[in-house]
């Protein structure tokens, strides 16, 4: 899996999107987890509604929300009031039984200031950014 970088500004909200094949993952709940080290499990932050048909309902855990468009095939995670310690490596997961498939690896970066972006010469807007080597980033 390539890693997609999402950059947000401290104190603001950041929306992370994870596209997936809606047919392949039909009937599966989704989750958002945080990788706390090179090895070790991905620590669950929040998961979609226990009833798959209600996956469109937004579920919160603290300042993190998850909602799933099961027809369109897009999982959306919202990080509200972003703080520096929210930065890290995360995964969007598709759950089946006790197993989990990785839909997308996401690197969340929290900047002190929008102009702290690595290409600060250009005006930058929060969200997905441009491409770095093996990390994929989109505007």
């Amino acid at each position: 899996h390539n890693t997609t970088v999402f950059q947000g500004v401290a104190g603001q909200s950041l929306q992370v999107s994870c596209p997936y094949d809606s047919m392949k993952h039909w009937g599966r709940r989704k989750a958002w987890c945080r990788q706390l080290g090179e090895k070790g499990p991905c620590q669950r932050v929040v998961s979609t509604h226990n009833l798959w048909l209600l996956s469109f309902l937004r579920r919160w855990n603290g300042s993190t929300a998850i909602t799933d468009d099961t027809l369109g095939g897009t999982l959306t995670i919202t990080l509200r009031n972003l703080q520096p310690h929210d930065a890290g490596l995360y995964q969007c997961q598709s759950l089946h039984g006790s197993e989990a498939d990785t839909l997308r690896k996401v690197l969340v970066e929290v900047l002190a200031d929008p102009l702290d972006h690595r290409d600060a010469g250009d005006l930058w807007f929060p969200g997905e950014s441009e491409s770095f080597e093996d990390a994929h980033v989109e505007h």
Epitope: V5, G37, E38, Q83, P84, H85, D86, A87, A112, H117
Partner: antibody, heavy 121, light 107 residues
Framework: ELQLQESGPVLVKPGASVKMSCKAS????????MNWVKQSHGKSLEWIGV????????SYNQKFKGKATLTVDKSSSTAYMELNSLTSEDSAVYYC??????????????WGQGTLVTVSA | DIQMTQSPSSLSASLGERVSLTCRAS??????LSWLQQKPDGTIKRLIY???TLDSGVPKRFSGSRSGSDYSLTISSLESEDFADYYC?????????FGGGTKLEIK
């Protein structure tokens, strides 16, 4: 063994620039944030800024914006900090301090030995 | 910016004594606080993170606790190598800020 080896002491003239280094070893350099901290003689510590070596993204303490520039060289696992337009106020020991996995969510577990910068005519 | 008010600024104590240092945060930091030890040669070592989690290899005589916006570092029985400078660090929000430090000296 994890090590952060900082460059040696420097004596520079007012108005000049200085670029110090912090060579990391014993871990995957791009997986961990790198912070820089200033300690003036007999004073407390001040956070300058942080860089994510994987993407090069930086965040600075507003106080050091325009004064410090953080960069990395992934090929040599080295972080750099350049200070410009030096004055006597910039005379201090500067530390690099490694963060946690793609973040600083547990603070700064590892510190370099510090680089002494003396600004004097 | 979040101000970290550290007290006392200096402390004289004897070997075997129990001492406590405190940092008060001017805003909520939700436990995102660590304690650092700086030896006279400038070497800095993290002792505690997340307010109360002891770093591996740090003696158990060190402990961290929280009461509201007050964070404490306690050394239960001072040993000779504990005489050093101590700083708290908040990493809850930018810019990260340090306490003014406590100089722990031998009585």
């Amino acid at each position: 063994e994890l090590q952060l080896q900082e460059s040696g002491p420097v004596l520079v003239k007012p108005g000049a620039s200085v670029k110090m280094s912090c060579k990391a070893s014993g871990y995957t350099f791009t997986d961990y944030y790198m912070n820089w901290v200033k300690q003036s003689h007999g004073k407390s510590l001040e956070w300058i800024g942080v860089i994510n070596p994987y993407t090069g993204a930086t965040s600075y303490n507003q106080k050091f914006k325009g004064k410090a520039t953080l960069t990395v060289d992934k090929s040599s696992s080295t972080a750099y900090m350049e200070l410009n337009s030096l004055t006597s106020e910039d005379s201090a020991v500067y530390y690099c301090a490694r963060g946690t996995y793609y973040s600083n969510y547990e603070g700064f577990p590892y510190w370099g030995q510090g680089t002494l910068v003396t600004v004097s005519a | 910016d979040i101000q970290m008010t550290q007290s006392p600024s200096s402390l004289s104590a004897s070997l075997g004594e129990r001492v406590s240092l405190t940092c008060r945060a001017s805003q909520e930091i939700s436990g995102y606080l660590s304690w650092l030890q700086q030896k006279p040669d400038g070497t800095i070592k993290r002792l505690i993170y997340a307010a109360s989690t002891l770093d591996s290899g740090v003696p158990k005589r060190f402990s961290g606790s929280r009461s509201g916006s007050d964070y404490s570092l306690t050394i239960s029985s001072l040993e000779s190598e504990d005489f050093a400078d101590y700083y708290c660090l908040q990493y809850a929000s930018y810019p990260y800020t340090f306490g003014g430090g406590t100089k722990l000296e031998i009585k």
